[in-house]
């Protein structure tokens, strides 16, 4: 359910998708991993307003509670919904293989 | 993957699942919900320090850029693995009916 | 060094179009947020308009909707502002901006501030 | 009219602390962070705090922000000549759909 796709705090700062350039070395893959050199990280970042593209139920009961005890529950928190596959050749024994990971890139955000 | 179940902040303090006691004026539910008055939420709270409880390769990723460049990628996020049904009694136009909700209860937590 | 440089200012009659440029440098371009903020001789800041690092979300100020449109291209690390049907009440130095990327500790959100300004382009419209 | 409510003025003397102060409502100043600007003469703005009370690397400790309820203020201690400027405070109004300044205030060294 996306519940409210509009952001209170201002444009951009509420949960979406975001494009952070890594090399394999800031992502420590340098000793297996050949190619890409660099990888186009796609993550969930941003705040979770009230039912702002709420994931599901439990998001919804952690907004309310959160309202009422901020100290005790935190907001939900932006998270991937869905990923894109993506192709890494990775060094090996005998040489190099392709391998698809389907959890690396974030495709879709919501807040749970 | 459950990488890494050894909270280094202290017992307690990482990412796991916690009982909140919830009425339905609480949660904003007493207009369409007979029953529970009262619901055990049971949530995600805690830190998410590296490696601890990753989801996938994608918190991985997010720990180690965090790591790098705290100020532009948050840490990963403790949240729900997995959920508990719950069933409610709801009020409808003619009476009552029961309503399984599976997506309310977190039953185990992970960070991502 | 992290810099942003308008240009496209001048001269224009009312009712008549231009197109400001911002030249970004010294920093991924496109990564962040970026704004246009206005200045009126002797006057306060006006907030213009804004655009999401990847085009896909843009706002308006109520005074410029319709006239104005914010654009990027980000494979030549440049903001645009095209600004039509325009009016003596638009003349102004108009500067560029772009929106700081810092996320707060725990709520993981982007601070809602311009943290790199430009010189400014001036504006004006009269016949 | 601006949307935020600032002092048009204010004055002190060197080494003396002076304090501006933003007025706004539940829709912006009320429900969102503020961000404070200094615009030296005949320069472009600079941000100073954002986020109600952070400064960015580079900017002194004499200046720091606050903000209680709809109101927020910029404090400013140990007065220099060089803080002579015009002081914006911004905040996003979501009733609005816009990012609202303050009318400025110029501040006087004597």
């Known amino acids: 359910a996306r519940n409210g796709d509009h952001c209170p705090l201002g444009p951009g700062r509420c949960c979406r998708l975001h494009t952070v350039r890594a090399s394999l070395e800031d992502l420590g893959w340098a000793d297996w991993v050949l190619s890409p050199r660099e990888v186009q990280v796609t993550m969930c970042i941003g705040a979770c307003p009230s039912q702002f593209r709420a994931a599901n139920m439990h998001a919804q009961i952690k907004t309310s509670l959160h309202r009422l005890k901020p100290d005790t529950v935190p907001a939900p928190c932006c998270v991937p919904a869905s990923y894109n596959p993506m192709v890494l050749i990775q060094k090996t024994d005998t040489g190099v293989s392709l391998q698809t990971y389907d959890d690396l890139l974030a495709k879709d955000c919501h807040c749970i | 993957a459950r990488n890494g179940d050894h909270c280094p902040l202290g017992p307690g303090r990482c990412c796991r699942l916690h009982t909140v006691r919830a009425s339905l004026e609480d949660l904003g539910w007493a207009d369409w919900v007979l029953s529970p008055r009262e619901v055990q939420v049971t949530m995600c709270i805690g830190a998410c320090p590296s490696q601890f409880r990753a989801a996938n390769m994608h918190a991985q990723i997010k720990t180690s850029l965090h790591r790098l460049k705290p100020d532009t990628v948050p840490a990963p996020c403790c949240v729900p693995a997995s959920y508990n049904p719950m069933v409610l009694i709801q009020k409808t136009d003619t009476g009552v009916s029961l309503q399984t909700y599976d997506d309310l209860l977190a039953k185990d937590c992970h960070c991502i | 060094e992290v810099q942003l440089l308008e240009s496209g200012g001048g001269l224009v009659q009312p009712g008549g179009s231009l197109r400001l440029s911002c030249a970004a440098s010294?920093?991924?371009?496109?990564?962040?947020?970026m704004s246009w903020v206005r200045q009126a001789p002797g006057k306060g800041l006006e907030w213009v308009s804004w655009?999401?690092?990847?085009?896909?979300?843009?706002y308006y100020a109520d005074s410029v909707k319709g006239r104005f449109t914010i654009s990027r291209d980000n494979s030549k690390n440049t903001l645009y502002l095209q600004m039509n049907s325009l009016r003596a009440e638009d003349t102004a130095v108009y500067y560029c901006?772009?929106?700081?990327?810092?996320?707060?500790?725990?709520?993981?959100?982007?601070?809602?501030?311009?943290?790199?300004w430009g010189q400014g382009t001036l504006v004006t419209v009269s016949s | 009219q601006s949307v935020l409510t600032q002092p048009p003025s204010a004055s002190g003397t060197p080494g003396q602390r002076v304090t501006i102060s933003c007025s706004g409502s539940s829709s912006n100043i009320g429900s969102n962070d503020v961000t404070w600007y200094q615009q030296l003469p005949g320069t472009a703005p600079k941000l100073l705090i954002y986020d109600d009370s952070h400064r960015p690397s580079g900017v002194p400790d004499r200046f720091s922000g606050s903000k209680s309820g709809t109101s927020a203020s910029l404090a400013i201690s140990g007065l220099r000549s060089e803080d002579e400027a015009d002081y914006y405070c911004?905040?996003?109004?979501?009733?609005?759909?816009?990012?609202?300044f303050g009318g400025g205030t110029k501040l006087a060294i004597l």
């Open positions: 911004g905040s996003w109004d979501y009733s609005l759909n816009a990012y609202v």
């Open positions: 655009i999401s690092y990847d085009s896909s979300s843009k």
């Open positions: 901006a772009r929106y700081g990327i810092k996320t707060r500790t725990n709520n993981a959100y982007y601070a809602n501030a311009m943290d790199v």
């Open positions: 010294g920093f991924t371009f496109s990564s962040y947020d």
